[in-house]
Amino acid sequence: HTAAQDNCTCPTNKMTVCSPDGPGGRCQCRALGSGVAVDCSTLTSKCLLLKARMSAPKNARTLVRPNEHALVDNDGLYDPDCDPEGRFKARQCNQTSVCWCVNSVGVRRTDKGDLSLRCDELVRTHHILIDLRHRPTASAFNHSDLDAELRRLFRERYRLHPKFVAAVHYEQPTIQIELRQNTSQKAAGDVDIGDAAYYFERDVKGESLFQGRGGLDLRVRGEPLQVERTLIYYLDEIPPKFSMKRLT
C-alpha cells in the first residue's frame, strides 16, 4: 500500500494529491509541484517537499562548536530541481540563469555562477547539528531523560534509526542533536538524516508536514519542551568551495 487505504491520504506528507489510481485501485499519492509518486510509509525527500512548498499558495507556509566547514541555510527557499528519485540535483539554477552547487540537503556549497558552472557530483551531508534553545523551565531537564526522549522522537515520528542519532548535548537552555550518516551506513529503506532534520525543523516551527497527525508535543517526564529557536548546521563529506571574498 502506498498510502492510507481507506480515505486515500498520505500520513507522512500533507503536500500531496492522492487518488485510487494505483495498481489494483490502490491509493497513490503524488507530491505537489513535481507530480512524483511518493511512498507514504516514510518521509518524503526534502527536495520534493521544497518543490511542493514553492508551488503552494504563498500564504500556506557539552556543546559542540561547528567547524569552519559547517554550512547554514542562509539562502532561504528556492524552487529546486530534483532527480527522479526525489534527490536534489547537484546543480541548481534560478530563472535568471544564476547557478550554484548544493549538497544532499539542498544547501548551497559554492559561490553562485552562471550556466557554465559545473557540479560534478551531489556531495553528501553526513553530519547535521541541530542547535535548539528551549523556553525557560523551573529546572533543567534531566540529561539522560532528554536524550532518551529525543532519540525516541526521531525513531517514532521520523522513522530514523537511533544509530544515526550520534549524540544529544545539553547545557540549559541549549540542546544540540547530532545526526550522523555516512554513505556507507545508509541502507535501502533508511530515512535520510537530511529529511528527518527538515521534518523536525518544520515541526518545531509549528508547520508539521504530517497529515492528520498532531503537532509536535515533546515532553520529558511530563514536562513540555518548548523550542524558542532552531539553528541547523550541515557538514558535508567534502568541504564546501567558497571564495575568500565570502569568508571575510
Epitope: P11, S41, R151, E156, R159, P162
Partner: antibody, heavy 118, light 109 residues
C-alpha cells in the same frame, strides 16, 4: 544468532531478582533489546526496552520504578526486578528488534521462569 | 495505544479459514506485527508492517489493515497452525501499558 535468558528462580514476595539476556552471533549495538513477560496461561506483556548503543531505556507505565534494564557487557543485558509479588510470576523473554526504526521482534530467547511464592 | 484483539478463541477445521482482528486505540500507521506462539515456545514473528510476510512464512498467512483496524487471515488451515496469535503495535514505546493484543487461540479441528 540467538538470545538466551537466565536467572529465573523461585523467590519470596518482596524479594529482588536480576535476569540476564545473553546474545550470541551478532553485535548488540544498533539493536534494541526488549523484555516481555507471560504469566501462566496469559498473554504477552511488554516490560521495557533498551537501545544498546545509546543506552536509552524505556518502560511500560506499570513497570516504571520497579524494573530496570541495563547493558552489562558487550553481549549481555539485564533486567533487575524489585519488590516482587505473586503477580510477577511469569516466563520472562528477551527479544531483539529487527534493526529498523520499528519495534518488530524477529529474534526471541526461549524464556526463563520466575516464580514468586512464599 | 491499547490493542484490542478479537476473538479470544476460534475453532475451524483443517482447510478452513480464520480471521483475527486487532484494533488500536489510536492510528499506528500500519506499524503492526503478528506473532504465532505455540505452548512452551517463544513467539515467532509472522507479519510486520501490517502486511509484509517474514521470511519463511507461508503465503497462507495474510495481514491487512491501516489506521486503527487490522486483520490476520489464515487460509487453508493446517494442523500445525494451531497456536495462539498476538498482534503488536510497533509504532511507539512511549507512555503505554502494553504493546501487545490479548491473543487469539486458534484450534484446528
Amino acid at each position: 544468532q540467538s538470545l538466551e535468558e537466565s536467572g529465573g528462580d523461585l523467590v519470596q514476595p518482596g524479594a529482588s531478582l536480576t535476569l540476564t539476556c545473553k546474545a550470541s552471533g551478532f553485535d548488540l549495538n544498533n539493536y534494541s533489546i526488549l523484555w516481555v513477560r507471560q504469566a501462566p496461561g496469559k498473554g504477552l506483556e511488554w516490560i521495557g526496552s533498551i537501545y544498546i548503543s545509546g543506552g536509552s531505556t524505556y518502560y511500560a507505565n506499570w513497570a516504571k520504578g520497579r524494573f530496570a534494564i541495563s547493558k552489562t557487557s558487550s553481549t549481555t543485558v539485564t533486567l533487575q526486578m524489585t519488590s516482587l509479588t505473586a503477580a510477577d510470576t511469569a516466563t520472562y523473554f528477551c527479544a531483539r528488534d529487527d534493526g529498523t526504526a520499528s519495534y518488530y521482534l524477529n529474534l526471541w530467547g526461549p524464556g526463563t521462569l520466575v516464580t514468586v511464592s512464599s | 495505544y491499547d490493542m484490542t484483539q478479537t476473538p479470544a478463541s476460534v475453532s475451524e477445521p483443517v482447510g478452513g479459514t480464520v480471521t483475527i482482528k486487532c484494533q488500536a486505540s489510536e492510528d499506528i500507521y500500519k506499524l503492526l506485527a503478528w506473532y504465532q506462539q505455540k505452548p512452551g515456545q517463544p513467539p515467532k514473528l509472522l507479519i510486520y508492517a501490517a502486511s509484509d510476510l517474514e521470511s519463511g512464512v507461508p503465503s497462507r498467512f495474510k495481514g491487512r489493515g491501516s489506521g486503527t483496524d487490522y486483520t490476520l487471515t489464515i487460509s487453508d488451515l493446517e494442523a500445525a497452525d494451531a497456536a495462539t496469535y498476538y498482534c503488536q503495535q510497533a509504532y511507539t514505546i512511549g507512555n503505554i501499558d502494553n504493546s501487545f493484543g490479548g491473543g487469539t487461540e486458534v484450534v484446528v479441528k
